[in-house]
């Protein structure tokens, strides 16, 4: 039975050229996390497997960094980075938990909603 819940940073915004941390947290379960996939619509950005560690898509290697923890740091943001991001937690024995984050990359400095998760 799946008892856990995924908490995410929710809807966030950041400035063009800046950085942001996409973060999900699995709570209320003792299940072991075997793998986390970070996906953006139809693309696999990164995968973190408990045995293999992190693998980042070459298309994003220059702008994506693993962590902190099981989160993902996006750098040198562009307006094209606006959209939905999904953290998919594969766990044993519970199964799969999915969290959704919507990121809006803004041209100007009106990114106050994402400030808590931005990297100076």
């Amino acid at each position: 039975m799946m008892t856990g819940t995924i908490e995410t940073t929710g809807n966030i915004s950041a400035e063009k050229g800046g950085s942001i941390i996409l973060q999900c947290h699995l709570s209320s379960t003792t299940a072991q996390v075997t793998q986390v996939n970070w996906e953006q619509q139809d693309q696999l950005l990164a995968i973190c497997n408990a045995d293999l560690g992190w693998h980042i898509s070459p298309s994003f290697k220059d702008r994506v960094a693993p962590g902190p923890g099981l989160g993902l740091t996006l750098q040198s943001l562009t307006v094209n980075d606006t959209g939905e991001y999904f953290c998919i937690y594969h766990t044993y024995p519970d199964g799969t938990y999915t969290g959704r984050i919507f990121l809006e990359v803004l041209e100007s400095s009106v990114a106050e909603h994402g400030a808590r998760f931005q990297i100076p």
């Epitope: 075997t34 793998q35 996939n37 996906e39 693309q43 696999l44 995968i47 497997n49 045995d51 024995p93």
Partner: nanobody, 117 residues
């Protein structure tokens, strides 16, 4: 116990192609990720490609554009199509899978690929 069995390796000339297969046998369950790796003599194991249960893929820079990973979920089989092979692709090729009902990754026994010049 789930086992992974690779096949399709062999000797090929530079510029040629090979298609590797990796089949899961035994009490198989759904998988969340299957991938290909290789290890050349005296070198560390190298990541090549991963495919998720949602058919999303991720490649190493060294093989992107030359190698293609695909999967047949119904057969619990993953493939690696290797084109434009080079002598430096010579290695033992391994597949690995993360099954839903497993704490750890499962590895195959490997298949030898030799590319002659």
């Amino acid at each position: 116990e789930v086992q992974l069995v690779e096949s399709g390796g062999g000797l090929v000339q530079a510029g040629g192609s090979l298609r590797l297969s990796c089949a899961a046998s035994g009490p198989t369950f759904s998988w969340t990720m299957m991938g290909w790796f290789r290890q050349a003599p005296g070198k560390e194991r190298e990541f090549l490609a991963i495919i998720t249960d949602g058919s999303k893929t991720l490649y190493a820079d060294s093989v992107k554009g030359r190698f293609t990973i695909s999967a047949d979920n119904a057969k619990n089989t993953v493939y690696l199509q290797m084109n434009s092979l080079k002598p430096e692709d010579t290695a033992v090729y391994y597949c690995a899978a993360q099954f839903t009902l497993a704490r750890h990754l499962v590895w195959g026994q490997g298949t030898q690929v030799t590319v002659s010049s």
